[in-house]
Interface confidence: low
């Protein structure tokens, strides 16, 4: 083997955001002369699991038949090609939805408003949560999330949108979670359609920019960030 072993690639199928009970496969791809693949889970001693390569020996399959809390977390893989070990892959964040009951998303004062009216999206959870995420269908990323300060557990979060224009119209959902585990999310709320009638003024910036946190004990941190497994949550709603 000339030079260092290439870093392997790790990915999940059908994706890295998996609903509770659904199957998921973690793949690790290295080189054709790999003898053994190891998968590490952050917070667990290494290796979390070990697999022999599948022919033609350049990748290994780690199967999770049914997604539970047990499997949510950050994974890296590496492989052995005698006499060396590869470096670790980039991390894979495996996120589970369905850890908590789905919240209820509503639009105040109404899901049918006139351009220029102020609108607030209200996300209510059945049990106390401290992190709420709002999604708009078709948006590349989640909108800013609300996280309560000092770990306060709340049953709701407000997403004030201010005066709306047609740009704000669309389908929204929200998800709740608890900050002690970024990898465990609630089921997504049922979708809510916001319809904005009559646009007499020039369009305002996109909702991603215009949403600001509610006043009070809430603290807004923008999404996504590179280290946050909740970034890039776009599909796999159910």
């Amino acid at each position: 083997q000339a030079g260092p072993l290439p870093k392997p690639t790790v990915w999940a199928e059908p994706g890295s955001v998996i609903s509770w009970g659904s199957p998921v496969t973690i793949w690790c791809q290295g080189t054709l002369d790999a003898q053994e693949y190891h998968l590490d889970k952050e917070g667990s001693p290494a290796p979390w699991d070990t697999q022999n390569p599948l022919e033609p020996r350049n990748k290994a399959k780690f199967s999770i038949p049914s997604m539970t809390q047990h499997y949510a977390g950050r994974y890296r893989c590496y492989y052995h090609s005698h006499p060396d070990w590869s470096e670790d892959s980039d991390p894979l964040d495996l996120v589970m939805t369905g850890a908590y009951s789905k919240p209820i998303l509503s639009v105040l004062p109404s899901p049918l408003v006139t351009s220029g009216e102020s609108v607030t999206l209200l996300c209510q959870s059945q049990s106390p949560m401290d992190t709420f995420l709002l999604f708009k269908e078709g948006a590349a990323h989640p909108l800013p999330r609300l996280r309560s300060q000092h770990g306060a557990q709340l049953h709701w979060a407000e997403f004030p949108m201010g005066p709306v224009t047609s740009v704000h119209g669309g389908t929204y959902r929200c998800i709740s979670s608890r900050s002690f585990s970024h990898y465990l999310l609630s089921r997504p709320s049922d979708p809510v359609e916001l319809t904005v009638l009559g646009s007499l003024e020039s369009p305002s910036p996109s909702p991603t920019r215009s949403i600001s946190a509610a006043a009070g004990p809430e603290d807004q941190s923008l999404m996504p960030t590179g280290s946050d497994p909740q970034s890039g949550l776009r599909r796999h709603w159910e």
């Epitope: 667990s44 047990h70 369905g98 585990s181």
Partner: antibody
């Protein structure tokens, strides 16, 4: 305070079925897995399976696949285990145990246990 | 399935004595998924140590746990009368989740 209150002792005939209940209080019932464990007299513990009350998803020890059926009633925060086709081998104490997730160690464990339900199978 | 073998099956210790019991797995178990439970006669088991070394709520600091791979242990630095009980190790690294046969700790 978290409490799991199980139903009382059962004396049943061979071939019959029995349904044991486990009523949870003091926490959000849908947040934690509910595990069921068997302990035969003077013996060790045997894991039967679990149910996730949030969506009714279950996982069983294959040994108990056709022996036990796990269900929940979210409205009353109660978990149930039905045991089928009972024989003397099924005489034991059965425990329910709720399992919170300990995120910072990436693990969950049976943290809260019911008082146990004694099932005696005898003709 | 992963078989957990506890040794000794029965042991007795004097008050103040240091006690160690072991749990050996038939194949490697991640330390995150190895727990210990305490059970006294006529009572339900109680979570005692979770994820190899974390003491459950209310467990005295004289208890500790350690280990990795296939070998784990529970230690009491100084035996007290209330520690007399049966201790079970438990894994859920692989399904089915399994328990060891237990170590019964008695007072000498």
């Amino acid at each position: 305070e978290v409490q799991l209150q199980q139903s009382g002792p059962e004396l049943v005939k061979p071939g019959a079925s029995v349904k044991i209940s486990c009523k949870a209080s003091g926490y959000t019932f849908t947040d934690y897995n509910m595990d069921w464990v068997k302990q035969s007299h003077g013996k060790s513990l045997e894991w039967i399976g679990y149910i996730y009350p949030n969506n009714g998803g279950t996982g069983y020890n294959q040994k108990f696949n056709s022996k036990a059926t796990l269900t929940v009633d979210k409205s009353s925060s109660t978990a149930y285990m039905e045991l089928h086709s009972l024989t003397s081998e099924d005489s034991a104490v059965y425990y329910c145990a709720s399992s919170p997730y300990y995120d910072y160690v990436g693990s969950y464990a049976m943290d809260y246990w019911g008082q146990g339900t004694s099932v005696t199978v005898s003709s | 399935q992963i078989v957990l073998t506890q040794s000794p099956a029965i042991m007795s210790a004097s008050l103040g004595e240091r006690v160690t019991m072991t749990c050996t797995a038939s194949s490697s178990v991640s330390s995150s998924y190895l727990h210990w439970y305490q059970q006294k006669p006529g009572s339900s088991p109680k979570l005692w140590i979770y994820s190899t070394s974390n003491l459950a709520s209310g467990v005295p600091a004289r208890f500790s746990g350690s280990g990795s791979g296939t070998s784990y242990s529970l230690t009491i630095s100084s035996m007290e009368a209330e520690d007399a009980a049966t201790y079970y190790c438990h894994q859920y690294h692989r399904s089915p989740r399994t328990f060891g046969g237990g170590t019964k700790l008695e007072i000498k």
